[in-house]
Interface confidence: low
């Protein structure tokens, strides 16, 4: 059935609208030369190809102007749906973001995805990460087995749109403390806790004593 259709299609080629805009048209290959300003496009059928002359190239192709003949050339940009030239994409495939004529599954650093247009727009510009800080906890570098180390980066430029969030400017990770026990009798958390309880008890006792003195003085004055 496919071959019958192919034969009948080829037989009526010269009168077929496919020859529109051709300078030369054959029953075997369709157009081989186009009128000025039209683009030559090869349409495939089985493993035979047919030439057509088009005002604009189909999706996935761009118009390449050349002295001998203008032709439709394939967009060779990865994940591109339509392009303006050999290396400049104008519309990406679904799920990809357009950025400077290329298609990305994630916007490059410094750019943020604008979902409504599927483009990468200038995002919140941040500086380089600082070195990881000292491993510490509660501002102490000892007395714990595990601590946290932090690194930061500065916001260099605020985003163009308020809806675009800035990336994280501080991050922490768990780290092993250099010293589990503090030198020079510095107390571990448990010892500190005991000391605090003792201090609290003394304060309560002192407060009670002062209150008794106050009551006694008050009675004497009456």
């Amino acid at each position: 059935q496919g071959n019958r259709w192919r034969r009948s299609k080829r037989a009526s080629y010269v009168s077929n609208p496919i020859c529109k805009g051709c300078l030369s048209c054959s029953k075997d290959n369709g157009c081989s030369r186009c009128q000025q300003k039209l683009f030559f496009f090869l349409r495939r059928e089985g493993m035979r190809q047919y030439g057509e002359c088009l005002h604009s190239c189909p999706s996935g192709y761009y118009g390449h102007r050349a002295p001998d003949m203008n032709r439709c050339a394939r967009c060779r940009i990865e994940n591109c749906d339509s392009c303006f030239s050999k290396d400049f994409c104008t519309k990406c495939k679904v799920g990809f973001y357009l950025h400077r004529g290329r298609c990305f599954d994630e916007c490059p650093d410094g750019f943020a995805p604008l979902e409504e247009t599927m483009e990468c727009v200038e995002g919140c510009e941040v500086g380089h990460w600082s070195e990881w800080g000292t491993c510490s906890r509660n501002n102490r570098t000892c007395g714990f087995k595990w601590g946290l180390e932090t690194r930061t980066r500065q916001i260099v430029k605020k985003p163009a749109k308020d809806t675009i969030p800035c990336p994280t400017i501080a991050e922490s990770r768990r780290c092993k403390m250099a010293m589990r026990h503090c030198p020079g009798g510095k107390r571990t958390p448990k010892a500190k806790e005991k000391r605090n309880k003792k201090k609290k008890r003394k304060l309560i006792e002192r407060a009670q004593e002062q209150h008794s003195v106050f009551l006694a003085t008050d009675r004497a004055n009456q």
């Epitope: 290959n29 030439g51 060779r76």
Partner: antibody, heavy 119, light 110 residues
Framework: EVQLVESGGGLVKPEGSLKLSCVAS????????MSWVRQAPGQGLEWVAH??????????YYSGSVKGRFSISRDDSRNMVYLQMNNLRTEDTATYYC??????????WGQGTQVTVSS | QPVLTQSPSVSASLGASVKLTCTLS???????IEWYQQHPDKSPKFLMQ??????SKGDGTPDRFSGSSSGAHRYLSISNLQLEDEAIYYC?????????FGSGTQLTLL
Amino acid sequence: EVQLVESGGGLVKPEGSLKLSCVASGFTFSDYFMSWVRQAPGQGLEWVAHIYTKTYNYATYYSGSVKGRFSISRDDSRNMVYLQMNNLRTEDTATYYCTTDEDWYFDFWGQGTQVTVSS
Amino acid sequence: QPVLTQSPSVSASLGASVKLTCTLSSQHSTNYIEWYQQHPDKSPKFLMQVRDGSHSKGDGTPDRFSGSSSGAHRYLSISNLQLEDEAIYYCGLSDVSLYLFGSGTQLTLL
């Protein structure tokens, strides 16, 4: 940059089987027709098999010399094209090239993988 | 009669010009053809597609290479021959369900 890397070649006995693989990168693989072309030692080029894209229901074509013995397939999720070769003959000894065939000719070629069929 | 006929070898001098011929059989005389270049122990490389009176070059094909046609003949012309042009040149064409290559022409530089 378009890259095609073939693998799976080797020495096999007549009537044996071998599966060649080709991994593609640098272009949207699922959009492109793919072919295998071979070259016997000191000989010319011979087109072997061709596979269309999903749009064309992965239609396949084979040269007369391999029809019924070889099978071309593709895995778009892995950017791979395969050539399953069964009932191999000594005349199948060749370097097998993986090629892109989207622009209606073999515009990009891999480095090739050697297949030797010998007892 | 083979579908594509190429002369086995052609010799030319460095800096000169050469014209390689690929002749199509009568039933394919209106077809487009392609030219490929292959250096020893290297993969073939697509050079161009030749149509009636025009050609489309592949990426990286030098301007020194051009294609033309006359009747059933398709030509590959190379001007200002360079050492790197010494190679085998194949022509090829696609038909309804197969692709055919010529036997190749060995270009040797003198």
